[in-house]
């Protein structure tokens, strides 16, 4: 089995997590991709996913999560904006490849969000930017449900998660339209 490694990101409330997940573009360019949270003792839960097939560079926003899949570059960009302490946890990028198990990209992300004034609001990077606007996308994200012979079959989600503008106050911990997706490496 592949050794799962973690990359720690320590950010303050209000900042933005900005993760670049690389993939082999010839293989996975149009595959559907997802951002998942992994809670202790639970299967990974999908918080947001790209469309199927994934659209090149087209942003998909679910609450405070923005996914951008750059087919030309083999890169999935994941941003979680306006971070809250309760967003702390373990996350991962995956590629859906039915009927096989989802394929994990990149290292898992150990996000630690602490209280305190953020000197660079809207970003976890150095203040090298002069423009940072979050587009008000209105895409609906329908994430598939996959099961594995090694996991319990689960019921499909009640509905799709509506996309909201950056002004929306949606806590990731309160998102109900999430899907459990098993990931094995």
């Amino acid at each position: 089995a592949t050794k799962l490694t973690e990359e720690k990101y320590e950010l303050k409330e209000g900042q933005t997590l900005d993760v670049k997940c690389d993939y082999t573009l010839e293989k996975f360019a149009s595959s559907q991709k997802a951002w998942q949270i992994i809670r202790d003792g639970e299967m990974p839960k999908t918080l947001a996913c790209t469309e199927r097939p994934s659209k090149n560079s087209h942003p998909v926003q679910v609450g405070r999560i923005i996914l951008e899949d750059y087919h030309d570059h083999g890169l999935l960009r994941v941003r979680m904006v306006n971070l809250q302490v309760e967003d702390s946890g373990l996350y991962q990028c995956v590629i859906y490849q039915p009927p096989k198990e989802p394929h994990m990209l990149f290292d898992r992300i150990r996000l630690v969000v602490t209280k305190g004034f953020s000197g660079t609001p809207g970003s976890n990077e150095n203040s090298t930017q002069n423009v940072y606007k979050i587009p008000p996308t209105t895409t609906k994200a329908l994430c598939p449900l996959y099961t594995s012979p090694r996991t319990v079959t689960q019921a499909p989600p009640k509905s799709t998660a509506d996309v909201s503008t950056p002004d929306s106050e949606i806590n990731l911990t309160n998102v109900t339209d999430i899907i459990r997706v098993p990931v094995f490496n």
Partner: antibody, heavy 116, light 107 residues
């Protein structure tokens, strides 16, 4: 085939200005981040600036912040770099590149020489 | 700013031999690392991204490995066209930064 053709380089005095342009073809320009990377004579590579497809995000290296402005015209498939208050240390070949983080395609570059 | 350090500065290798180039980051860049090749008078060319994924059209003799702060580019059997300068670059954080380069020359 991806093509990136830079223009606008030349000799300029310290404190002067230049506007570099890049004509892009062979790919969907409006779907791609674009950047400028420079290379001083006999030296290594230095990232200068990056711009998102819709210009909603723009980033600069500290050394050029406040002096250089990256912009794009998606209707004309063109990328620009307005360089003001030029210094001797800005002397370099400037490459137009496709990508905002890592760089898949490069132009052949245009030489900017800042000297009195 | 993440500082990228490449070693050695110059590597003398005979054609057909293996070349191993190193790149170290001053802090973790996860797998957000790319390698480029530049020949005299030419623009750089992307070889590897995501630390280990070969870019389109890159021969299998080029391979990348590593994660976090330590990375390696290996050229399994050097061909005449491989003698060039190689740069690593991190793209985890702004500002994007390159290593100083390793020149691979004929021994």
């Amino acid at each position: 085939e991806v093509q990136l053709v830079e223009s606008g380089g030349g000799l300029v005095q310290p404190g002067g200005s230049l506007r570099l342009s890049c004509a892009a073809s062979g790919f969907t320009f409006s779907s791609n981040w674009m950047s400028w990377v420079r290379q001083a004579p006999g030296k290594g590579l230095d990232w200068v600036a990056s711009i998102k497809q819709d210009a909603s995000e723009i980033y600069y290296v500290d050394a050029v912040k406040g002096r250089f402005t990256i912009s794009r015209d998606n209707a004309k498939n063109s990328l620009h770099l307005q360089m003001n208050s030029l210094r001797a240390e800005d002397t370099a070949v400037y490459y137009c590149v496709r990508g905002g983080w890592r760089f898949e395609s490069w132009g052949q570059g245009t030489l900017v020489t800042v000297s009195s | 700013e993440i500082v990228m350090t490449q070693s050695p500065a110059t590597l003398s290798v005979s054609p057909g031999e293996r070349a191993t180039l190193s790149c170290r980051a001053s802090q973790s860049v996860s797998s957000n690392l790319a390698w480029y090749q530049q020949k005299p008078g030419q623009a750089p060319r992307l070889l590897i991204y995501g630390a280990s994924i070969r870019a389109t059209g890159i021969p299998a003799r080029f391979s990348g490995s590593g994660s976090g702060t330590e990375f390696t580019l290996t050229i399994s059997s050097l061909q005449s066209e491989d003698f060039a300068v190689y740069y690593c670059q991190q793209y985890k954080n702004w500002p994007l930064t390159f290593g100083g380069g390793t020149k691979v020359e004929i021994k």
